[in-house]
């Protein structure tokens, strides 16, 4: 089965509250072509949430995903 093409995602605003870490499944950084930098978290219910890459909790979650077992 084939996936349809997906446009590049950009963040125009960031979540105003910290997402519980156990809600997070994966992440990606937005393209340099976007007007704002962003980290998009993919939640365990398959929703996408924009977060500010300069925030400490965002950096921690990204690091933990990269270093997980």
């Amino acid at each position: 089965s084939l996936a349809a093409d997906t446009p590049t995602a950009c963040c125009f605003s960031y979540t105003s509250r910290q997402i519980p870490q156990n809600f997070i499944a994966d992440y990606f950084e937005t393209s340099s072509q976007c007007s704002k930098p962003g980290v998009i978290f993919l939640t365990k219910r398959s929703r996408q949430v924009c977060a500010d890459p300069s925030e400490e909790w965002v950096q921690k979650y990204v690091s933990d995903l990269e270093l997980s077992a």
Partner: nanobody
Framework: EVQLVESGGGLVQPGGSLRLSCAAS???????MGWYRQAPGNEREFVAR???????NYEDSVKGRFTISQDNAKNTVYLQMDSLKPEDTASYVC?????????WGQGTQVTVSS
């Protein structure tokens, strides 16, 4: 830009095993791949993921029973599912993250029943 082809689903008895595959094709670098599942009437839920560097994460309900692995050269991810239970019955949907987006497959059906 990215196409995902899933295979390996089917009907299996409780306690049995299946191995799902998801092959990604396209011209972009894949950062991570993984699986969600969706049973009829339920929300899509996370199963497992693996990063290009080999980092893995699992949903608690599948830890110790499911194993995710990858072949980076083939841009393919595998989900080995052992000790299957009736509650594992669902459509298993592969995803890949790359090129600043999440790309989804169409899903492969897994039915666990005696």
């Amino acid at each position: 830009e990215v196409q995902l082809v899933e295979s390996g689903g089917g009907l299996v008895q409780p306690g049995g095993s299946l191995r799902l595959s998801c092959a990604a094709s396209g011209s972009i670098f894949i950062n991570s791949m993984g699986w969600y599942r969706q049973a009829p009437g339920n929300e899509r839920e996370f199963v497992a993921r693996i990063s290009s560097g080999g980092s893995t994460n699992y949903e608690d309900s599948v830890k110790g029973r499911f194993t995710i692995s990858q072949d980076n050269a083939k841009n393919t991810v595998y989900l080995q599912m052992d000790s299957l239970k009736p509650e594992d019955t669902a459509s298993y949907v592969c995803y890949a993250i790359g090129g600043g987006a999440v790309h989804w497959g169409q899903g492969t059906q897994v039915t666990v029943s005696s």
